[in-house]
């Protein structure tokens, strides 16, 4: 059986442009190396937001310039995306790959619709 990935349907970003959600996968095997990718789907275009590979039991580390951070616990990954603006509203898909040992397994979530509302500028005070 292929791998199942679950993620929330909808998340609202904070006023500071931060959105967090959990990506959970049902691992069919005893993977030691897992890759998690967040993809954004707009129309038929799919772009990579961020990706991280981690060893089971170790922390999830994204690249220094990544807009994502995350922590892992068992078969759950807690993902946080920051620096979001209204134009970034869209469907964010969690993709999980069991990289090692073979066989490779793929799991793709149905996506989390992240809504981002830009904060109103503060009115000038006299």
């Amino acid at each position: 059986k292929a791998m199942h990935v679950a993620q929330p349907a909808v998340v609202l970003a904070s006023s500071r442009g931060i959105a967090s959600f959990v990506c959970e996968y049902a691992s069919p095997g005893k993977a030691t190396e897992v890759r998690v990718t967040v993809l954004r789907q707009a129309d038929s275009q799919v772009t990579e937001v961020c990706a991280a590979t981690y060893m089971m039991g170790n922390e999830l580390t994204f690249l220094d310039d990544s807009i994502c951070t995350g922590t892992s616990s068992g078969n759950q990954v807690n993902l946080t995306i920051q620096g979001l603006r209204a134009m970034d509203t869209g469907l964010y898909i969690c993709k999980v790959e069991l990289m090692y040992p073979p066989p490779y397994y793929l799991g793709i979530g149905n996506g989390t619709q992240i809504y981002v509302i830009d904060p109103e500028p503060c009115p000038d005070s006299d």
Partner: antibody, heavy 110, light 101 residues
Framework: GVVQPGRSLRLSCTAS????????MHWVRQAPGKGLEWVAV????????HYGDSVKGRFTISSDNSKNTLYLQMNSLRAEDTAVYYC????????????WGQGTLVTVSS | QSPGTLSLSPGERATLSCRTS?????LAWYQQKPGQAPRLLIY???SRATGIPDRFSGSGSGTDFTLTISRLEPEDFAVYYC?????????FGGGTKVEIK
């Protein structure tokens, strides 16, 4: 090219327009008049590779991301390795192949 | 993959079947013409690839999948392959040849 059984051959495939390290890169082959057979994949930064059962231990996939070039080192070649070999790019949403090379015919014969 | 060969006339409907050993929706369909590399038609069992006409549609889940060509055009006569990509090794079906009756 034509190569004798037991000998070695290295295939290469150079791509442009995308960054190798963002994708899984694959080799797929097709024996004359037959169907498609997946051969091997190299993932992202190159640290993980997976192979089809028929080539495991004989073929090695590698890449040079700085050159956007994919390689397939084929050792201990057999007559049944005769095929057109395609390089192919796995898509972001999975290892289905949206871009294919034109293919190169490898004939193993004495 | 079944049938091995499908003999049909232009304008007819073609229904191709694929049964996989892996239960998932990670299934793709390709079209291949003689002397050419395969061309991606469908991924994720039912999503059309970019530039593929809407006469091509994919359906199914679990282990049983179908590719339907609603009205065959002359350029649709070719060999069609399914492929599962949920678990390595990524296996292809044996192919179905759609030929002119």
């Amino acid at each position: 090219g034509v190569v004798q059984p037991g000998r070695s051959l290295r295939l290469s495939c150079t791509a442009s327009g995308f960054t190798f390290s963002n994708y899984g890169m694959h080799w797929v082959r097709q024996a004359p008049g037959k169907g498609l057979e997946w051969v091997a994949v190299i993932w992202y930064d190159g640290s993980n590779k997976h192979y089809g059962d028929s080539v495991k231990g004989r073929f090695t996939i590698s890449s040079d991301n700085s050159k956007n070039t994919l390689y397939l080192q084929m050792n201990s070649l057999r007559a049944e390795d005769t095929a057109v070999y395609y390089c192919a790019r796995g898509e972001r949403l999975g290892s289905y192949f949206d871009y294919w090379g034109q293919g190169t015919l490898v004939t193993v014969s004495s | 993959q079944s049938p091995g060969t499908l003999s049909l006339s232009p304008g007819e409907r073609a229904t191709l079947s694929c049964r996989t050993s892996v239960s998932s929706s990670y299934l793709a369909w390709y079209q291949q013409k003689p002397g050419q590399a395969p061309r991606l038609l469908i991924y994720g069992a039912s999503s059309r690839a970019t530039g593929i006409p809407d006469r091509f549609s994919g359906s199914g889940s679990g282990t049983d999948f179908t590719l339907t060509i609603s009205r065959l055009e002359p350029e649709d006569f070719a060999v069609y392959y399914c492929q599962q990509y949920g678990i390595s090794p990524f296996t292809f079906g044996g192919g179905t040849k759609v030929e002119i009756k």
